[in-house]
């Protein structure tokens, strides 16, 4: 698995540099996870032809991933940044279960899931410090995510498949779009 | 072959509309970020606007933001920047690009240009 | 908008002259920045990326260098086909420009 952010050879070489300030934490944070999750696409990609497979929507209806729509105030037109905030950490907290699900689909890079999902627990700690109003953050019901990951664990081969590049596509989308709209805070 | 081609520039009055094309074919707009730079006559570049594949999301310069629009058909593969309230200063080539990679870090791939001219 | 500042706006050089460009930012934008040269009447090229990256094909003499809101891009020994304009590009958000940098010959 790669250095966390702020333990690369880098940072070492360089004690007089000036410390990351929140923003700068986040945005490495986030880009160390979008790292992580494009050599777990790589796995994935390899082992199956999901990557270009047109039955996509079979499997999402199974699916609930979180997206962002003009409505959550990430996008340039429209920005509200404490609605975005809100919006970027509930999905966050979302996607937990199925980076949990992710845990055991990869053999070589079994390492490599666990760093993401770790990174994302991370990560929404970050964020959670940034946000002024934690009240407006739904977290997901413990038995509701149970059921799911249990839902998404009997599914068939090629179906758990599918889900694997679902939820990393999407987790890739979700991240990459929050990270544009952070810089924008 | 990878490449983008625009079209649909020309010569257009103040406060008009025009709208430019971008037709990119060897890869998929849909699972890449596209942007718009223009080059107005013997000056430097100009970002003009981009496109995150994901959601549609566009984001633009303060100088065109509010006239500008970008959008894209997937189903033909193609990238648009619809121009209203055209100015003077909106006279340019226009380039259509391809940034590179999933954190946007470089523009590896250009169109030809399209120039756009805004004058009575 | 990020504004990005480039200097100097034209500089005089001759071949085997080692020359630096500087780029500034107007914010931090970590290392998400880009050089690029273009000549007259064709499409820009990448020369670096992520500041320091040198892009694949591209000479050896070309260097970048810098992190948040100061950066360089230096060409250590020119070539006749260095004369050129030079552009930096940051890519934190959005895609802004410096005005550019002409590299012409003494």
């Known amino acids: 698995a790669p250095v966390p952010p702020g333990e690369d050879s880098k940072d070492v070489a360089a004690p007089h540099r000036q410390p990351l300030t929140s923003s700068e934490r986040i945005d490495k944070q986030i880009r160390y996870i979008l790292d992580g999750i494009s050599a777990l696409r790589k796995e994935t990609c390899n082992k199956s032809n999901m990557c270009e497979s047109s039955k996509e929507a079979l499997a999402e209806n199974n699916l609930n991933l979180p997206k962002m729509a003009e409505k959550d105030g990430c996008f340039q037109s429209g920005f509200n940044e404490e609605t975005c905030l809100v919006k970027i950490i509930t999905g966050l907290l979302e996607f937990e279960v199925y980076l949990e699900y992710l845990q055991n689909r990869f053999e070589s890079s079994e390492e490599q899931a666990r760093a993401v999902q770790m990174s994302t627990k991370v990560l929404i700690q970050f964020l959670q410090k940034k946000a002024k109003n934690l009240d407006a953050i739904t977290t997901p019901d413990p038995t509701t995510n149970a059921s799911l990951l249990t839902k998404l664990q009997a599914q068939n081969q090629w179906l758990q498949d599918m889900t694997t590049h679902l939820i990393l596509r999407s987790f890739k989308e979700f991240l990459q779009s929050s990270l544009r709209a952070l810089r924008q805070m | 072959e990878v490449q983008l081609v625009e079209s649909g520039g020309g010569l257009v009055q103040p406060g008009g509309s025009l709208r430019l094309s971008c037709a990119a074919s060897?890869?998929?707009?849909?699972?890449?970020?596209m942007i718009w730079v223009r080059q107005a006559p013997g000056k430097g570049l100009e970002w003009v606007s981009d496109l995150y594949y994901y959601a549609g999301d566009t984001y633009y310069a303060d100088s065109v933001k509010g006239r500008f629009t970008m959008s894209r058909d997937i189903s033909k593969n193609t990238v648009y920047l619809q121009m209203n309230s055209l100015r003077a200063e909106d006279t340019a080539v226009y380039y259509c690009a391809r940034w590179a990679d999933d954190h946007p870090a470089w523009v590896d791939l250009w169109g030809r240009g399209t120039l756009v001219t805004v004058s009575s | 908008d990020i504004q990005m500042t480039q200097s100097p706006s034209t500089l005089s050089a001759s071949v085997g002259d080692r020359v630096t460009i500087t780029c500034r930012a107007s914010?931090?934008?970590?290392?998400?920045l880009a050089w690029y040269q273009q000549k007259p009447g064709k499409a820009p090229k990448v020369l670096i990326y992520k500041a320091s990256t040198l892009e694949s094909g591209v000479p050896s003499r070309f260097s970048g260098s810098g992190s948040g809101t100061e950066f360089t891009l230096t060409i250590s020994s020119l070539q006749p086909d260095d004369f050129a304009t030079y552009y930096c590009?940051?890519?934190?958000?959005?895609?802004?420009f410096g005005q550019g940098t002409k590299l012409e010959i003494k």
């Open positions: 590009q940051q890519s934190w958000l959005g895609g802004s």
């Open positions: 914010q931090g934008i970590s290392s998400w």
């Open positions: 060897g890869f998929t707009i849909s699972s890449n970020y």
